[in-house]
Amino acid sequence: LEETLLNTKLETADLKWVTFPQVDGQWEELSGLDEEQHSVRTYEVCDVQRAPGQAHWLRTGWVPRRGAVHVYATLRFTMLECLSLPRAGRSCKETFTVFYYESDADTATALTPAWMENPYIKVDTVAAEHLTRKRPGAEATGKVNVKTLRLGPLSKAGFYLAFQDQGACMALLSLHLFYKKCAQLTVNLTRFPETVPRELVVPVAGSCVVDAVPAPGPSPSLYCREDGQWAEQPVTGCSCAPGFEAAEGNTKCRACAQGTFKPLSGEGSCQPCPANSHSNTIGSAVCQCRVGYFRARTDPRGAPCTTPPSAPRSVVSRLNGSSLHLEWSAPLESGGREDLTYALRCRECRPGGSCAPCGGDLTFDPGPRDLVEPWVVVRGLRPDFTYTFEVTALNGVSSLATGPVPFEPVNVTTDREVPPAVSDIRVTRSSPSSLSLAWAVPRAPSGAVLDYEVKYHEKGAEGPSSVRFLKTSENRAELRGLKRGASYLVQVRARSEAGYGPFGQEHHSQTQLDESEGWREQLA
């Protein structure tokens, strides 16, 4: 980027620069015509017959340097070829010299500083690349010369530029004084300010553009070169904050549009809101969950919103004495999550009708909650109780939801308790064809024993047709019609209002071989 200090092409009034000495053949200000056919102010000198060593000087007005350390001067000039000038002497030149003089104010006069090298600082002797020439019988032809010179380093508030002619026929068509600066640059979302280089290269700290944050690592910097170009160098740079994405060639951060979001700073663009969420404002880092939908604390910010599952379905119970096997089907709606678990709540009602949460005597296998499989075995059920089990399905957002948790209930009533198995059977009498048996009355939990059932069969005769039954209301029985000297297996069970209890252990008895032993009482 170039910042102009002086451009004579843009001047409309007379330049009125200072010349020295005040003699004929001196630099003269004239109107000229530039490439765009605009009138410009020019200076011309054409004293090709002067005495050797005589110089014509032309000095610009005072030019403030505006912080520039090096200033560039682009000269556009034309010059006549000495060979085309028949009256030109040996002093005719095709060069001129450029000088500058620094000062802190516009203090120069017609005579000061002295018109010579030192105090003036020589910049360069400029030779024409293109000469305007005229050959007899032909039109004059020529081209404009363009030369850029570098002045400096400068340290004072301003300077004058001076031109010394020592015998050229030339016109200074325009003078452009400028300095180079690195233009404001935005790269990788980092803004580097406009910078005037003070040295060969100057480090420049960058700052993040609006809605961007520094990337990890060293703060971004670029080098501004003396020629006004930024040194090509990777920039760690910045990245757009959450809710913003890079736009316009990585030069600015644009807020995510409604319905989109960006959860993290860094690269990447705004994404549509995930399922069951929305963003009603621009610049969203996270999309809000719809009513009834949630994100678990462990869910990423960009995860879809989910809802608690519906209730499990089709609970099936299988009661086996004091044990209960429950199983069910998965809920129709999982809520959009994979972390489905089940839990059970339990209430028990006594035969009298008073109900309470289940006591600690129940055991659940694998447990009452955090079940991953759709079944459970409940043990320790008490007889003649009614149990209500509520099976709920849960997931990672169930704890965030308000309102009742849907459940599938199942009611199970246990049987009243039957008498225990009858054991301790005794043979009170034995004959070749009969056996008399007696046993202790079992302690029935639910009322008295109503009667007993005796089951017996000859040992070795295992088929169903060989088994015989005998009912008795007393805690004794006589088995008749038995074989002589045969072994029999006997079992007894008691019946109460709750029903039959289990048969007791098989008791081994044997009939007599002959009558002589007859009706002998035996103890089992």
């Epitope: 004239l30 015509l33 056919q37 011309e44 009256r87 005229k134 032809t141």
Partner: antibody
Framework: QVELVQSGAEVKKPGSSVKVSCKAS????????ISWVRQAPGQGLEWMGK????????DYAQKFQGRVTITADESTSTAYMELSSLRSEDTAVYYC???????????????????WGQGTLVTVSS | DIQMTQSPSSLSASVGDRVTITCRAS??????LNWYQQKPGKAPKLLIY???ILQSGVPSRFSGSGSGTDFTLTISSLQPEDFATYYC???????????FGQGTKVEIK
């Protein structure tokens, strides 16, 4: 502002020559083109030739080639036009005119003439 | 030689009229065309050069256009002091023989 002052009216015999002068006052002379233009009574303008004093040599219209000589004296900032072998049809007002820009200060080689002398009447009569 | 042809050779117009004069070159002269105004007994005055560039001090009612072979001088609103003869001239060819057109006389209607 430059001024071009021409020499006075002349009456010439056919076959003779006439030399008209044109003195420029104020500023640069050597690098401007000085053209000579004539105008016969009741007629249009006719370009005769031009000189850029610094170069010395002049350019002429084909019609006047060999009969006209244009010169310049840089020391006095004066241009001259001499026309020989005069004929009655050479009776005209003769103007000198300076180009708008010097040979050095225009990007285009414009010969547009923005400064004119007052004119010199040359009468050729026997 | 290159020929410069102006038309019309004369025209009558009233103050305030828009007047157009054309000039045609026999060969392409790019934009190297000038327009002059001459009043009786006076030296010509440069109005326009480079086909369309208004000479310093010339009123803006004068304008020029064209390139190549066809050129136009326009006076947008004729003023009393504009009654004169107008000449075109070419700057392009060397040597510039036949430089001037024959002139267009603008008279009061």
């Amino acid at each position: 502002q430059v001024e071009l002052v021409q020499s006075g009216a002349e009456v010439k015999k056919p076959g003779s020559s006439v030399k008209v002068s044109c003195k420029a006052s104020g500023g640069t002379f050597s690098t401007y083109a000085i053209s000579w233009v004539r105008q016969a009574p009741g007629q249009g303008l006719e370009w005769m030739g031009k000189i850029i004093p610094i170069f010395g040599d002049a350019d002429y219209a084909q019609k006047f080639q060999g009969r006209v000589t244009i010169t310049a004296d840089e020391s006095t900032s004066t241009a001259y036009m001499e026309l020989s072998s005069l004929r009655s049809e050479d009776t005209a007002v003769y103007y000198c005119a300076r180009s708008s820009y010097t040979i050095l200060t225009t990007y285009y080689n414009y010969n547009a003439m923005d400064n004119w002398g007052q004119g010199t009447l040359v009468t050729v009569s026997s | 030689d290159i020929q410069m042809t102006q038309s019309p050779s004369s025209l009558s117009a009233s103050v305030g009229d828009r007047v157009t004069i054309t000039c045609r070159a026999s060969q392409n002269i790019n934009n190297f065309l000038n327009w002059y105004q001459q009043k009786p007994g006076k030296a010509p005055k440069l109005l326009i050069y480079g086909s369309s560039i208004l000479q310093s001090g010339v009123p803006s009612r004068f304008s020029g256009s064209g390139s190549g072979t066809d050129f136009t001088l326009t006076i947008s609103s004729l003023q009393p002091e504009d009654f004169a003869t107008y000449y075109c001239s070419q700057d392009h060819f060397y040597p510039p023989s036949g430089t001037f057109g024959q002139g267009t006389k603008v008279e009061i209607k």
